[in-house]
């Protein structure tokens, strides 16, 4: 069950200030955050986990990936899980911790030493789930070794958004992923109506920037559901 996965091996930690960095939700071994209880004047810790639901890896932290907490688990339950360290099994790059990538089902180091100039590596894109691509085949993309050491500029190949420079995110473009600009106010955005639909995009857009949300454009409220245009709008 979800709780048994989430509530095993709890570690209590010293709590941060309210509104600051807290513990890690939904991993096998995790810190429980401190919370300032209303009416109280001291922090206490919680000896259980805080599952953080997600639809894709980008909604999780850089040290996490999005997946069902149990093998063959409920498709509607995906949470942020701790990334996998070197030599751990993986199905895609985002499962591996920063500085590693998924090769032949194992997280391996992406250190400079492991690359000789440019190498060809398989990027298996997940279109809706961890196990399949759009046509069942892996796409091959050339990755430059330097992408792991300098933040990618717009158009650079990436594995995750943390590979890209500030103001950019890592988004699907054909069969690879490249750094694209985070969307600004007024720009068209994609609102995923159902879980998993983000995986079908060949040209994926970034998310809206801080302080913006993807909403139906005011003058499109009367339009049919399928033709509604979403743009990044201020709160």
């Amino acid at each position: 069950t979800l709780n048994s996965v989430l509530n095993s091996n709890a570690i209590k930690n010293l709590p941060p200030p309210l509104g600051g960095a807290a513990g890690h939700p939904g991993s096998a071994v995790s810190a429980a955050p401190g919370i300032l209880y209303p009416g109280g004047n001291k922090y206490q810790t919680i000896d259980n986990y805080q599952p953080y639901p997600c639809a894709e890896d980008e909604e999780c932290g850089t040290d996490e990936y999005c997946a069902s907490p149990t093998r063959g688990g409920d498709a509607g339950v995906q949470i942020c899980l701790a990334c996998r360290k070197r030599r751990k099994r993986c199905m895609r790059h985002a499962m591996c911790c920063p500085g590693n990538y998924c090769k032949n089902g194992i997280c391996v180091s992406s250190d400079q030493n492991h690359f000789r100039g440019e190498i060809e590596e398989t990027i298996t894109e997940s279109f809706g789930n961890d196990h399949s691509t759009l046509d069942g085949y892996s796409r091959r993309t050339t990755l430059s070794s330097k992408m792991y050491h300098t933040k990618g500029q717009e158009g650079s190949v990436c594995l995750r958004s943390s590979d890209c420079a500030s103001g950019l995110c890592c988004a699907r473009h054909f069969w690879s992923k490249i750094c694209k600009p985070v969307l600004k106010e007024g720009q068209v955005c994609t609102k995923h109506r159902r879980k998993g639909s983000h995986g079908l995009e060949i040209f994926q857009r970034c998310y809206c920037g801080e302080g913006l949300s993807c909403r139906i454009q005011k003058d499109h409220h009367q339009a049919s559901n399928s033709s509604r245009l979403h743009t990044c709008q201020r709160h």
Partner: nanobody
């Protein structure tokens, strides 16, 4: 300043229903997961339910699965918890929480950073 305000709590008989609401202000929450937690007297605060920013993924505590439903309205910046078939053991203060946006905003860990003050739910037998 970020504010989460819960409402909808109250006294209800076992088997009854309540709908909690959590209104968010001071920040755009449509890009962030939101959750409900509860704390009964003399017990630690526990997870109840959470929902992803898109509403596409939800998670529930085993104790409420099939009885409680979490939903959100991003246009209204509100998250809801529909509680059916309430039991006396559901009696607690219910807290709304909002997440931080994960790697989208440079965080290494996705987590709940903001909390409401809570609303009391009492289920009598």
């Amino acid at each position: 300043e970020v504010q989460l305000v819960e409402s909808g709590g109250g006294l209800v008989q076992a088997g009854g229903s309540l709908r909690l609401s959590c209104a968010a202000s001071g920040r755009t929450f449509s890009n962030y997961p939101m959750g409900w937690f509860r704390q009964a007297p003399e017990k630690e605060r526990e997870f109840v339910a959470a929902i992803s920013w898109s509403g596409g993924s939800t998670a529930y505590a085993d104790s409420v699965k099939g009885r409680f439903t979490i939903s959100r309205d991003n246009a209204e910046n509100t998250v809801y918890l529909q509680m059916n078939s309430l039991k006396p053991e559901d009696t607690a203060v219910y807290y709304c929480a909002a997440g931080n946006g994960g790697r989208n905003y440079g965080h290494s860990r996705a987590r709940y950073d903001y909390w409401g003050q809570g609303t009391q739910v009492t289920v009598s037998s």
